[in-house]
């Protein structure tokens, strides 16, 4: 019996087609992805093959103005329109709190939304009961397939799930649910989830009874043969893991941003064992036409976005200096504003030991593309912010050793004076440079704001200590020559859309007046 699994993950609000790098589509003839194009391909496959499942491995939420405005209603509407069969909860599905998940998505989705390792407690337990499930048995033709979901247990540090959801260890939570499916005589089981490729592989290895793992979170690109675009494969598609009980378990992921549609064909024997698996992600490029009906619906929903981008978010009573003459040479108040917003966006529940889990931000000055003049009545709009942060990036959470941070700050000024983009703006960090010294030895003082303290204060950076830092995904990926970050980071979790982080902060503050205050000397 053959099953075709179509899968997406980490779509992050890319409802419209995008450029090849998943930013805003500029030249339509070269654009990719988007739900209208995805629908065309999905329907093509549904028409050609008998047993097809369309699955999403989480993080539909967050990433463009679509999410900012529609807050998840767009996800439910268009996933319903594409007739998804199931979705796993990702960490970003909690970005607007549990209510921001329940109302727009859980109550509106016609497909099951899954996670076996999220347990509700307290008053939330009854409110959310049945709205998401640990697993679902799906009929496919004359057979049944069990889908069991999982979500990153780091979600409380990455999003806003509140205090009434417990995120358990994935493997511990999955095993009993898979066992339950087996007792229901379900012998074909897919683990669908959002914990990253390393955990996907562990699940394939450790959870008895899981036949296939469809993952997300790490934006992993797998491919067999010559890749069709810029993404470099992390391994073959599917990636085969030998389980502890000796089975070959295919593991797949489909990069991110709706650029590819994962396509996996699985052949099962009559006892539900995987006999063979093959496939590849399908690049959704302009050779695949956008479905006119879905496209028309997108255009209808688009109208509200255009109105939103000119509305006032808040006011500034000072000039927001985002000029390259400032931000690539010295501390600039636009850099301070953005870093403060980045930290504010990552405030999580404190405990008796930590006032917050992260206190530091770094931001390449070259990523700040425009100032904002306060003389326009102080008004700040989304449009203004899109000029400052035009690249559609995210502000991510990484864990780095102090020694890596020191290298990053040395890199920040290794060729100072040439107006290059690697000059770092900061938050929760005090850095002192001596530019008379030779490159690689210019950082003379580097103090960082404590997190394990009730009153935050600055302490000298410790080389062997592991620190959490918020930074643009561009830096996490080694951009602007920050190869040491990419090579030495111990953990990387993608965060929220850059403009959204700053706009939310400005809306919250209402009036802003960031200063240059001696963070960089």
């Amino acid at each position: 019996w053959e099953l075709t699994i179509l899968h997406t993950n980490d779509v992050h609000s890319r409802l419209e087609q995008t450029s090849e790098d998943s930013s805003k589509c500029v030249n339509a003839s070269r654009c990719m992805g988007g739900v209208a194009r995805l629908f065309t391909k999905v329907q093509q496959i549904r028409r050609a093959e008998p047993n097809v499942l369309l699955l999403d491995a989480g993080d539909q939420y967050q990433g463009t103005i679509w999410f900012t405005v529609y807050k998840g209603a767009e996800v439910a509407h268009f996933m319903n329109a594409l007739r998804y069969d199931a979705m796993a909860l990702g960490n970003h599905e909690f970005d607007n709190g549990v209510e921001g998940l329940i109302e727009p998505l859980l109550k509106e989705a016609k497909f099951p939304i899954l996670s076996a390792n999220i347990k509700a407690k307290g008053p939330l337990a009854s409110q959310i009961s049945g709205l998401y499930l640990p697993y679902k048995v799906l009929p496919v033709g004359d057979e049944v397939v069990g889908i069991v979901g999982y979500t990153s247990k780091e979600t409380p540090f990455l999003s806003n799930p509140g205090t009434n959801l417990v995120f358990e260890d994935e493997i511990t939570a999955l095993q009993p649910e898979v066992d339950k499916l087996k007792t229901l005589n379900v012998n074909k089981i897919i683990a669908l989830g959002h914990s990253g490729f390393e955990m996907d592989k562990l699940i394939a290895q450790k959870v008895r009874g899981v036949d296939v793992v469809v993952g997300g979170h790490s934006n992993t690109f797998l491919y067999t043969g010559n890749p069709p675009s810029k993404e470099v494969p992390a391994g073959k598609y599917p990636f085969i893991v030998t389980s502890d009980d000796g089975r070959k378990v295919p593991v797949v992921q489909a990069y991110a941003f709706g650029k590819y549609l994962g396509y996996l064909k699985i052949e099962f024997d009559e006892r539900g064992n995987v006999i063979s698996s093959h496939g590849n992600p399908i690049l959704l490029n302009s050779s695949i036409p956008e479905d006119p009906s879905i496209k028309a619906d997108i255009n209808k929903w688009r109208i509200k976005l255009d109105n939103y981008s000119t509305q006032e978010l808040g006011k500034t009573i000072v000039y927001l200096d985002g000029s390259s003459q400032s931000c690539r040479f010295r501390e600039c108040n636009m850099g301070n504003l953005i870093c403060d917003a980045m930290i504010n966006n990552n405030l999580r529940h404190a405990d008796e030991t930590f006032w917050n889990h992260v206190s530091m931000c770094i931001l390449n000055g070259g990523g700040i593309r425009s100032p904002i003049d306060e003389r326009n009545n102080g008004t700040i709009t989304w449009e203004n912010l899109a000029a400052v942060l035009p690249f559609g990036g995210t502000f991510d959470l990484v864990q780095l050793k102090g020694s890596t941070l020191k290298k990053a700050f040395e890199h920040s000024v290794h060729r100072y004076g040439q107006s290059t983009g690697e000059f770092l703006q900061v938050g929760g960090i005090h850095v002192v440079y001596d530019l008379s010294r030779k490159p690689g030895d210019r950082v003379v003082k580097l103090d960082v704001l404590c997190t394990k303290c009730r009153v935050p204060s600055y302490d000298p950076l410790k080389m062997d200590e592991v620190y959490k830092v918020i930074l643009p995904n561009f830096l996490a990926n080694g951009g602007d020559g920050f190869q040491m970050i990419k090579d030495e980071l111990l953990r990387h979790d993608s965060g929220d859309q850059d403009i959204n982080v700053v706009s939310t902060y400005i809306s919250k503050m209402k009036v802003i007046y960031p200063a240059v205050e001696g963070r960089i000397k």
Epitope: A81, R83, P139, G141, D142, D297
Partner: antibody, heavy 121, light 107 residues
């Protein structure tokens, strides 16, 4: 082979009740949404009811809502339509039809031969 | 409710003719449209689903096209056994609705 066979039709007085059955064979009945569709003499097709594969949802058009009830017994591979408060305009051939195996609306790939229901005093 | 309007309501054609039947939805239904053939005193038979997919066993002279609100069923070369009534049906949303039918008669 895949087959649907309706039964239970007949002549009934207005205001009375009737229960139609549809016996399925040749496929995994419990995996499919099942529908009733009717056709009044000399008229077109009208959808009457759906029940999801797992019985979790049922939908009806306004014309029969509150009077007709669709149900199924997956252990017996049988679909039912309980028709109460019958009216003259319910006179039709009633077809049982197989839908898809998901929770989305679907088309009908397999039809029964139909059973005639006449509501007349 | 979504109204389905079929045209023409009847047509006369000869064997070998190319026949086109149209179906219009009162609102967008994407590609969630099916076509059925019904012969007198018989149950309907599925021809096409998802606007353009041929049901297995249906001759390739039948084809469907369209998306959104306007759809077409085409019989490329009418055969004697094709004289029947044809119905479209939307399955975008409940209640499911059918067109009024198009009767294809022998000229």
């Amino acid at each position: 082979q895949v087959q649907l066979v309706e039964s239970g039709g007949g002549v009934v007085q207005p205001g009375r009740s009737l229960r139609l059955s549809c016996a399925a064979s040749g496929f995994t009945f419990s995996n499919y949404g099942m529908h009733w569709v009717r056709q009044a003499p000399g008229k077109g097709l009208e959808w009457v009811a759906v029940i999801w594969y797992d019985e979790s949802n049922k939908y009806y058009p306004d014309s029969v809502k509150g009077r007709f009830t669709i149900s199924r017994d997956n252990s017996k591979n049988t679909l039912y339509l309980q028709m109460n408060s019958l009216r003259a305009e319910d006179t039709a051939v009633y077809y049982c039809a197989r839908g898809g195996s998901s929770w989305y609306p679907d088309s009908f790939d397999i039809w029964g031969q139909g059973t005639m229901v006449t509501v007349s005093s | 409710d979504i109204q389905m309007t079929q045209s023409p309501s009847s047509l006369s054609a000869s064997v070998g003719d190319r026949v086109t039947i149209t179906c219009r939805a009162s609102q967008g239904i994407s590609s969630w449209l099916a076509w059925y053939q019904q012969k007198p005193e018989k149950a309907p038979k599925s021809l096409i689903y998802a606007a353009s997919s041929l049901q297995s066993g249906v001759p390739s002279r039948f084809s469907g096209s369209g998306s959104g609100t306007d759809f077409t069923l085409t019989i490329s070369s009418l055969q004697p056994e094709d004289f029947a009534t044809y119905y479209c049906q939307q399955y975008n949303s409940y209640p499911l609705t059918f067109g009024g039918g198009t009767k294809v008669e022998i000229k």
